[in-house]
C-alpha cells in the first residue's frame, strides 16, 4: 500500500489494515478508510472501515457477522435469479462470473418482456432489462422479479400490492412495495438489490437521469408517444403558464473536501447549461449545507431564471463558507428548500399548482445531525398536495434526485429521499467526483440534443473534434497542381459552409475531399454551390487582381451526416436555433440577433486553426466600432492592393475585419484556415458570424506561424448577416428555421 505505517491524523494505526490484492486510501482525515480493488474485483468482507474512539479500526465482519482476519480483493460475481416466474433460465448456477450469460424463455401462453439474454457486467450488475413472463391476465402487467430480489405477491388486480426483499447484507434500491394503480401502471419504481461495492457507471447515470429529467422538462402531448400495447411514459403537457423550479442542494460538509465540492459545482453548471439547452427557463434555488444551510439563490429572486446569473452565483460559492460548522444536516438543507417553496395559508402564488419542483441533492452520504430528512420530503409533498387525491395524485409535480458520491454513502438513506417513479431512476451512487463529472458531461450531450447547434463537449477527455464538432477539413486535389487545403463548418446534416475561393470552376466533385469529426474517411460531394455574386476576376480591369466579395460556398453532401459528439452543426445567424442558443425570446428578430452578436464595438470572437495536426482555438477581436476604419484601411498593405485608391473597392460591406494589436494582439489566419468559421462564443454556445476569406500578410510562410507580425496584419471574413438571402434560399430544406 502507498501509505507509510505511521498513525494518520485520526488515532488508528495503519498496521495490518492492508488488503490482499488491492490498496486502501484514507478518508475524512484518517477517520475512515476505503479499500480499492482492481476492476472486476471487490473488497471482501467490507469496502470501508472506520476508526473507533478506542484507537482501533472497525472489525472485518462478513454479511453473516463472521469475523475475518485480513481483507482481500475477490472476483465480482453477479447474483443469481432467486425466482423466475412462468418460465426457465439457463444456465443455472449459484453465482455468475463477469461476462457469463444467461438466457430466459417463457412457458406456453406467456410472453417475454425485457431482455431474453443478459450478461454479467464488471460492476456486478446484469446487462439489459428484467426478463418477465406474462400472460396479460392481470389488471396490471406482471411487475417482474429483478435479479437478486425476492417478490411476495402474485395477484395483479387493481390495488393489489407486491413487496420485494433483498438477501442479507444487500440494500434495496427503489420501491419495496408497489401497488397496481388505475390505468394499469405500478406505483413506485423497479427495485434492485445493491451490494456496497456496486456503483452506477457514468453512462448508466447519464442515461437514467437524463431520461427522467427529460420526462420532467419536455413539453410533450400527453396523448402522444405510445403505440398500442406500449406502456405510456410519463409525459407532461408543459402548460405555457406553468413553470419549473429546480433546487440545487450541495453538501459542503467536512467529509466532501474542497476538490469534490469544486467538482460538484462543475456538475451543476453543466446541468444548468443542459436545462437551458432545452429552451425551458426554470427558476433556480441554490443551497449549500453542512451543519447549517446557506441559501445563495432564492427561486423568488428576479434573476433566478437567468441561467447565466445563477451560474455566476454558483461559481462564486466557496467551500470555506461552511468551514467552521462542518457537520452534515441534510434535514435543515431540505427545510431551506421547503421555505422557498412555501407560502402563507390559503395564499398560494398564481400557478402554484402548475409549477413543477425538482430537487437535486448531491451528497457524500451520511446525515449525522438534525434528524431524518425524509420528514421534510413528506412536508413538501403535503405542501404541494402530492399523493393526497387518488384521482389526481400530482406525482409529476415533484422530482427528488439524489446523487451519492463515494464509498461512505448510506444507500438506505439516499434511497428513502429519492422519488420513485415507474421506469425512472432518481437515486444514483457514483464511485467518486470524477465519475460524477463524467455523468454531467455525458448528460449534456445525449442524443436528444445532438441536433442543437453550437454545442460542444468541453470535457477533459474530449478530443479536438469534441471541442470543435462543426469543423470540416477540405482539400481539393488538382492533377499536376498539387492540392489546396481549406476549412469549413457543418451547418446542417447535408451542408458544409466554406469559402468560394477554395475552388475553381474546373474542380470536379470527385476531386474535392471533405472530412468531419476527425474521421479518416472522406465524404461524397453532390455539388458545390457558389454565391452568385462571387467573381474573383470581377475587378481585374480596374487593376485589382483578386476580388473576394461574396467569397462563400456551400458544399452539399451526397449522404446525410450522422450527428454525434464529434460531428454537429454550428449555429447560423438569424435562425431559430440561434435564438434558442442565445436564450432570446422566441419573438426575436434577425436585427435583434445582429445587435446581440455584432454590436458596434470590438467583439470577442474566435477561429479554429490546425497546428501540428491539432485543432486550436484562436481568440480575435472583430473591429466593429471605432477601430473598424483603421482595420479596413490596412487592406492596402495586401499584395496587389497597393495601387487601390479607394479601399472600399476591395473591402466591401460584406467583410468583417480582425487582426492588429489593439485592443489585443490578435493571432492571424493562415492559408489553410480559409473557409473556416469566424465564431462568437456566447452563453456556452458557438455561433458562426463569418467565413474566413483573405489576409493582408501571409504569417505562415514555411508552414510555421510567425510570432512577430506587423500591426497591419489584418484578416477579412465574409459577414454572414450580409449573405443571408442566399443562405436562406440554399438551406431552405434543412429545417434551420430562418427568421
Amino acid at each position: 500500500t502507498p501509505w507509510s505505517l505511521a498513525r494518520p491524523q485520526g488515532s488508528c494505526s495503519l498496521e495490518g489494515v492492508e488488503i490482499k490484492g488491492g490498496s486502501f486510501r484514507l478518508l475524512q482525515e484518517g477517520q475512515a478508510l476505503e479499500y480499492v480493488c482492481p476492476s472486476g474485483f471487490y473488497p471482501y468482507p467490507v469496502q470501508t472501515r472506520t476508526c473507533r474512539s478506542t484507537g482501533s479500526w472497525s472489525t472485518l465482519k462478513t454479511q453473516d457477522q463472521k469475523t475475518v482476519r485480513k481483507a482481500e480483493c475477490r472476483a465480482i460475481h453477479c447474483p443469481r435469479p432467486h425466482d423466475f416466474e412462468n418460465g426457465e433460465y439457463w444456465p443455472r448456477s449459484p453465482y455468475y462470473n463477469v461476462s457469463d450469460e444467461i438466457s430466459f424463455h417463457c412457458y406456453d401462453g406467456y410472453t417475454l418482456r425485457g431482455s431474453a439474454n443478459r450478461t454479467c457486467q464488471v460492476n456486478g450488475r446484469w446487462s439489459g432489462q428484467t426478463a418477465i413472463c406474462d400472460n396479460g391476465a392481470g389488471y396490471c402487467s406482471n411487475p417482474g422479479i429483478p435479479i437478486g430480489t425476492r417478490k411476495v405477491g402474485s395477484q395483479y388486480r387493481l390495488e393489489d400490492s407486491v413487496t420485494y426483499h433483498c438477501s442479507r447484507g444487500l440494500t434495496l434500491r427503489g420501491s419495496q412495495r408497489r401497488t397496481c394503480q388505475e390505468g394499469g401502471s405500478w406505483s413506485g419504481t423497479e427495485p434492485s438489490c445493491q451490494d456496497s461495492f456496486m456503483y452506477d457507471t457514468p453512462q448508466e447515470v447519464a442515461e437514467a437521469f437524463l431520461s427522467s429529467l427529460t420526462e420532467t422538462i419536455e413539453g410533450v402531448d400527453a396523448e402522444d408517444g405510445h403505440g398500442p400495447g406500449e406502456q405510456q411514459k410519463r409525459k407532461i403537457v408543459l402548460d405555457p403558464s406553468g413553470s419549473m423550479n429546480i433546487y440545487l442542494v450541495l453538501d459542503g460538509s467536512d467529509s466532501i473536501g474542497a476538490s469534490n465540492f469544486t467538482g460538484a459545482k462543475k456538475c451543476l453548471v453543466n446541468l444548468i447549461e443542459k436545462v437551458a439547452s432545452y429552451g425551458v427557463k426554470p427558476r433556480y434555488g441554490l443551497v449549500t449545507y453542512a451543519t447549517y444551510p446557506k441559501i445563495w439563490v432564492k427561486v423568488s429572486e428576479a434573476d433566478s431564471s437567468n441561467a447565466d446569473w445563477v451560474t455566476k452565483q454558483l461559481n462564486e460559492i466557496n467551500y470555506e463558507d461552511h468551514k467552521l460548522k462542518s457537520g452534515t444536516n441534510t434535514k435543515k438543507a431540505l427545510q431551506a428548500v421547503y421555505s422557498m417553496m412555501s407560502w402563507p395559508d390559503d395564499v398560494p402564488p398564481e400557478g402554484w399548482n402548475r409549477t413543477r419542483h425538482v430537487i437535486i441533492l448531491m451528497t457524500d452520504g451520511l446525515h449525522n445531525m438534525g434528524g431524518d430528512p425524509i420528514t421534510v420530503i413528506d412536508e413538501i409533498r403535503d405542501l404541494l398536495y402530492i399523493g393526497k387525491d387518488r384521482k389526481n395524485p400530482r406525482e409529476d409535480y415533484l422530482d427528488v434526485y439524489v446523487f451519492g458520491v463515494g464509498p461512505l454513502v448510506n444507500q438506505v438513506n439516499i434511497n428513502a429521499l429519492a422519488s420513485k417513479k415507474d421506469n425512472e431512476q432518481h437515486v444514483f451512487k457514483v464511485k467518486d467526483m470524477e465519475n460524477l463529472e463524467d455523468v454531467f458531461y455525458q448528460m449534456i450531450d445525449e442524443s436528444q440534443s445532438l441536433s442543437l447547434c453550437g454545442m460542444v463537449w468541453e470535457h477533459r477527455k474530449g478530443t479536438d473534434y469534441h471541442k470543435q464538432p462543426w469543423q470540416a477539413k477540405i482539400s481539393v486535389i488538382r492533377p499536376s497542381k498539387g492540392h489546396e487545403s481549406c476549412m469549413g463548418a457543418v451547418v446542417s446534416e447535408y451542408f458544409v459552409l466554406t469559402a468560394a475561393h477554395c475552388f475553381t470552376v474546373d474542380d470536379k466533385e470527385h476531386s474535392i475531399k471533405v472530412s468531419v469529426g476527425g474521421e479518416k474517411r472522406d465524404l461524397e460531394i453532390e455539388v458545390v454551390l457558389f454565391h452568385p455574386n462571387y467573381n474573383i476576376n470581377g475587378k481585374k480591369e480596374a487593376g485589382i487582381p483578386e476580388f473576394y466579395d461574396y467569397d462563400v460556398a456551400l458544399i452539399k453532401l451526397k449522404n446525410k451526416l450522422k450527428y454525434g459528439q464529434t460531428i454537429r452543426p454550428i449555429c447560423l445567424p438569424c435562425t431559430e436555433g440561434t435564438t434558442r442558443a442565445l436564450r432570446l425570446p422566441p419573438t426575436t428578430t434577425c436585427q435583434q440577433q445582429k445587435e446581440e452578436l455584432l454590436p458596434a464595438q470590438d467583439i470577442k470572437a474566435l477561429f479554429v486553426s490546425e497546428e501540428e495536426k491539432k485543432l486550436t482555438r484562436k481568440e480575435v477581436y472583430i473591429k466593429n466600432g471605432d477601430k473598424k476604419g483603421s482595420c479596413e484601411r490596412d487592406a492596402q498593405y495586401a499584395p496587389g492592393y497597393d495601387k487601390v485608391k479607394d479601399i472600399s473597392e476591395v473591402v466591401t460591406p460584406r467583410f468583417l475585419c480582425t487582426g492588429g494589436v489593439s485592443p489585443y494582439a490578435d493571432p492571424n489566419t493562415c492559408r489553410g484556415d480559409s473557409g473556416g468559421p469566424l465564431i462568437v462564443h456566447k452563453r456556452s454556445r458557438f455561433i458562426q458570424v463569418g467565413v474566413i476569406s483573405w489576409g493582408v500578410v501571409d504569417v505562415c510562410k514555411n508552414q510555421k506561424r510567425q510570432k512577430q507580425v506587423p500591426a497591419h496584419a489584418r484578416d477579412f471574413h465574409i459577414n454572414l448577416f450580409q449573405v443571408l438571402p442566399w443562405l436562406k434560399e440554399k438551406l431552405q430544406d434543412e429545417d434551420l428555421g430562418f427568421l
Epitope: K298, V299, S300, E301, S339, M340, M341, S342, W343, P344, D345, D346, V347, P348, P349, E350, G351, W352
Partner: antibody, heavy 118, light 112 residues
C-alpha cells in the same frame, strides 16, 4: 365579466339570525376561495373567514367563530353567510370578496347592509 | 394577530402633486419564500373596496401606474405620483401573511 352579486339589505331583531348570499358569475366558482369581510359604520375592514367552494372547507377568524357560518351551493354558484344571535354590534356592511391566489381580493360584491334593531 | 397601523388622515394634497400614505405592521410581512404579503385597497365614497397593489409593490390589473408601493418588512408606503380627483377615498393596507388576515384602520386622502 366577473361579478359578485350580493343579496339586499336586512333589518333584523336582536337575538335573531340572518342569512345573506353572494352569487358569482363570469368565472368557475369552485376555482377561487370566497371570503367575507365586515365593515362597521365609519370603521375599518375586518376579515370574517373564507370558504373553499370546491369542497366546502371553511376557515374562520377566531373572533367570528360561533357567530358566522359559511356555506356554498355549487349548483347555483352561490356563497352564503349566516350570522346568529345578532346584537347591535353586528350592524354593518358585509362584503363577499374573491381571493385570487396571492393577488389579494381582486373582486368584491357591492355589500349587504345588516341593521340590528329592536 | 398582526396589527396594521395607519394614520387616519393624510396631509392634504393639491391635485396634480404627489401623495404618500404610510402603513406599518406589528410583525415583518416578509415570508421565507422572499415575498412580502402586504396589500393596498382603495375605497371610494359609497363603493366597495378595490385592490390597488398586491405583494407590496405589484400593480393590480387596471390600476393606473400613478400608484406604486414600496417598503421593508414592517414599514410600507403607497405613493400616488399625480393625484387626480378620482383618487379621493380611504386607503387600507392589509396583510395576508398570517390568518386572521388583518386590515389597517384606513387613511383618508384629503384634497386641498
Amino acid at each position: 365579466e366577473v361579478q359578485l352579486q350580493q343579496s339586499g339589505p336586512e333589518l333584523v331583531k336582536p337575538g335573531a339570525s340572518v342569512k345573506m348570499s353572494c352569487k358569482a358569475s363570469g368565472y368557475s366558482f369552485t376555482d377561487y376561495l370566497m371570503n367575507w369581510v365586515k365593515q362597521s359604520h365609519g370603521k375599518s375592514l375586518e376579515w370574517i373567514g373564507r370558504i373553499n367552494p370546491y369542497n366546502g372547507d371553511a376557515f374562520y377568524n377566531q373572533r367570528f367563530k360561533g357567530k358566522a357560518t359559511l356555506t356554498v351551493d355549487k349548483s347555483s354558484s352561490t356563497a352564503h353567510m349566516e350570522l346568529r344571535s345578532l346584537t347591535s354590534e353586528d350592524s354593518a356592511l358585509y362584503y363577499c370578496a374573491r381571493l385570487e391566489n396571492d393577488y389579494g381580493f381582486t373582486y368584491w360584491g357591492q355589500g349587504t347592509l345588516v341593521t340590528v334593531s329592536a | 394577530d398582526i396589527v396594521m397601523t395607519q394614520a387616519a388622515f393624510s396631509n392634504p394634497v393639491t391635485l396634480g402633486t404627489s401623495a404618500s400614505i404610510s402603513c406599518s405592521s406589528s410583525k415583518s410581512l416578509l415570508h421565507s419564500n422572499g415575498i412580502t404579503y402586504l396589500y393596498w385597497y382603495l375605497q371610494r365614497p359609497g363603493q366597495s373596496p378595490q385592490l390597488l397593489i398586491y405583494r407590496m409593490s405589484n400593480l393590480a390589473s387596471g390600476v393606473p401606474d400613478r400608484f406604486s408601493g414600496s417598503g421593508s418588512g414592517t414599514d410600507f408606503t403607497l405613493r400616488i405620483s399625480r393625484v387626480e380627483a378620482e383618487d379621493v377615498g380611504v386607503y387600507y393596507c392589509a396583510q395576508m401573511l398570517e390568518r386572521p388576515w388583518t386590515f389597517g384602520g384606513g387613511t383618508k386622502l384629503e384634497i386641498k
